[in-house]
């Protein structure tokens, strides 16, 4: 029959500066039942405020809605752990929205392949941003990231699109069954969880080129140019 | 009220087993536990472990690991201390004590075993 | 372990007296720190618990107070029924652990 452990709050994640939950993990178990609460204030401000809600974040978690969030200010908040033997307190975090963003997957990839009749194949895929982020506003920069690799493949091939939401790639193995997938990450903040993968059946009939690929680039405003495997790696992330 | 009633004094041999039970009333016993602390004849309180009636948790001391049990029964409410290879040197008071609202707020009467060949 | 060292082992006093008992850990114990009484053939009582709040029915003449380490227990005005061993006891970590107890005599 112990107090509780130190928890210790350890994860804040905002989807779209508008709303944001905080997460915690409970210190050693005391062997009896433990209750938790969260309180905050506004750096700055001395009033301390409990968590506005439990239960939307799941279980250790305090959510934060719309009318709970300020932008430009940092949050002070710990959590209290107390069975009848005593409290815990978690040490104090500091959380300011901006730089804990990380938006929903982005949403829609498709994913095709064409095959113009004067130049290579190759797969384009396009994607649209998570709804929950307004881009119109200026607020957020989104950068993005795809990765494939063919079915039965370990190793997962990744290439970096800057603010795009298209992309095109040269280069993959004919006959083969790809998926593909990408993530988004605010200028400042996490990247998201990748999409749902969506597969590609290559055309056994696709064109092989090692030495070229050819992709989008962003300053090209989605025209396309042949690049090499060298300057290739300056896109490239594995 | 809360009350914590542990059973008659008990006479053993060296090597036998004991087995001293703690029987709880006046609360919700499956959201504590049981924890027994012995006291030596002119000595102070020694705290032996305890049996979590919430969860079955057990946190012993180390120098009874070996052989003692503890446990909780919460159909009976009724805390168990089972101490087997006894030596002269667990001829003790034993009590019970237990969380109702605050640390260690109700014990038992007390249990003297007393061994002896 | 974490150590508990009371001090006096056994003090005197009048009725009326005010008398402090302390008790030092040999680490910090986050203020988990009980006391007891108790008197010749009979359980300990709780008196204080997290170093300085008292358990329901006991009187105000006691007081608990300290932190991290250092501890003491304060009787404002001794009563004969207050000739008895205290103990301290810390429960921040497993085993738990008693100090060796302060016996108040009456002078």
């Known amino acids: 029959q112990l107090p509780p452990g130190k928890p210790e709050i350890f994860k804040c994640r905002s989807p779209n500066k508008e709303t944001f939950t905080c997460w915690w993990r409970p210190g050693t178990d005391g062997g009896l039942p433990t209750n938790y609460s969260l309180t905050y204030h506004r750096e700055g401000e001395t009033l301390m405020h409990e968590c506005p809600d439990y239960i939307t974040g799941g279980p250790n978690s305090c959510h934060f809605g719309k009318q709970y969030t300020s932008m430009w200010r940092t949050y002070v908040m710990m959590v209290n752990a107390t069975n009848q033997m005593g409290s815990s307190f978690s040490d104090e975090l500091y959380v300011d929205v901006t730089y804990i963003v990380q938006p929903d997957p982005p949403l829609e990839l498709t994913v095709e392949v064409k095959q113009p009749e004067d130049r290579k194949p190759y797969l384009w895929m396009k994607w649209s941003p998570p709804t929950l982020i307004d881009l119109k506003t200026g607020w957020f920069t989104l950068l993005y990231e795809i990765r494939l690799k063919p079915e039965k493949a370990a190793e997962w091939e990744t290439h970096f699109a800057g603010q795009q939401t298209e992309f095109k790639i040269l280069s993959l193995h004919p006959g083969q069954k790809y998926l593909v997938q990408v993530r988004c990450k605010p200028d400042h903040g996490y990247w998201s969880a990748w999409s749902p993968a969506t597969f590609i059946q290559i055309p056994s009939d696709f064109i092989m080129n090692d030495e070229q690929k050819l992709i989008s680039e962003e300053d090209l405003g989605g025209e396309q140019k042949l690049i090499s495997e060298e300057d290739l790696h300056h896109h490239h992330h594995h | 009220q809360v009350q914590l009633v542990q059973s008659g004094a008990e006479v053993k041999k060296p090597g036998a087993s004991v087995k001293v039970s703690c029987k709880a009333s006046?609360?919700?016993?499956?959201?504590?536990?049981i924890t027994w602390v012995r006291q030596a004849p002119g000595q102070g309180l020694e705290w032996m472990g305890w049996?979590?009636?919430?969860?079955?948790?057990?946190d012993y001391a180390q120098k009874f690991q070996d052989r003692v049990t503890m446990t909780t029964d919460t159909s009976t409410t009724t805390g168990y201390m089972e101490m087997r290879s006894l030596t002269s040197d667990d001829t003790a008071v034993y009590y019970c004590?237990?969380?109702?609202?605050?640390?260690?707020?109700?014990w038992g009467q007390g249990t003297l075993v007393t061994v002896s060949s | 372990d974490i150590q508990m060292t009371q001090s006096p082992s056994s003090l005197s006093a009048s009725v009326g007296d005010r008398v402090t008992i302390t008790c030092r850990a040999s680490?910090?114990?986050?203020?988990?720190l009980a006391w007891f009484q108790q008197k010749p053939g009979k359980a300990p009582k709780s008196l204080i618990y997290?170093?300085?709040s008292l358990q329901s029915g006991v009187p105000s003449k006691f007081s608990g107070g300290g932190s991290g380490t250092d501890f003491a227990l304060t009787i404002s005005s001794l009563q004969p029924e207050d000739f008895a061993t205290y103990y301290c006891?810390?429960?921040?970590?497993?085993?738990?652990?008693f100090g060796q107890g302060t016996r108040l005599e009456i002078k």
């Open positions: 004590t237990t969380v109702v609202r605050r640390p260690f707020d109700f």
């Open positions: 006046g609360y919700t016993f499956g959201t504590s536990g």
């Open positions: 049996s979590s009636a919430y969860n079955g948790k057990t």
């Open positions: 680490q910090d114990i986050n203020n988990f």
């Open positions: 997290a170093a300085s």
């Open positions: 006891q810390q429960y921040s970590s497993y085993p738990i652990t």
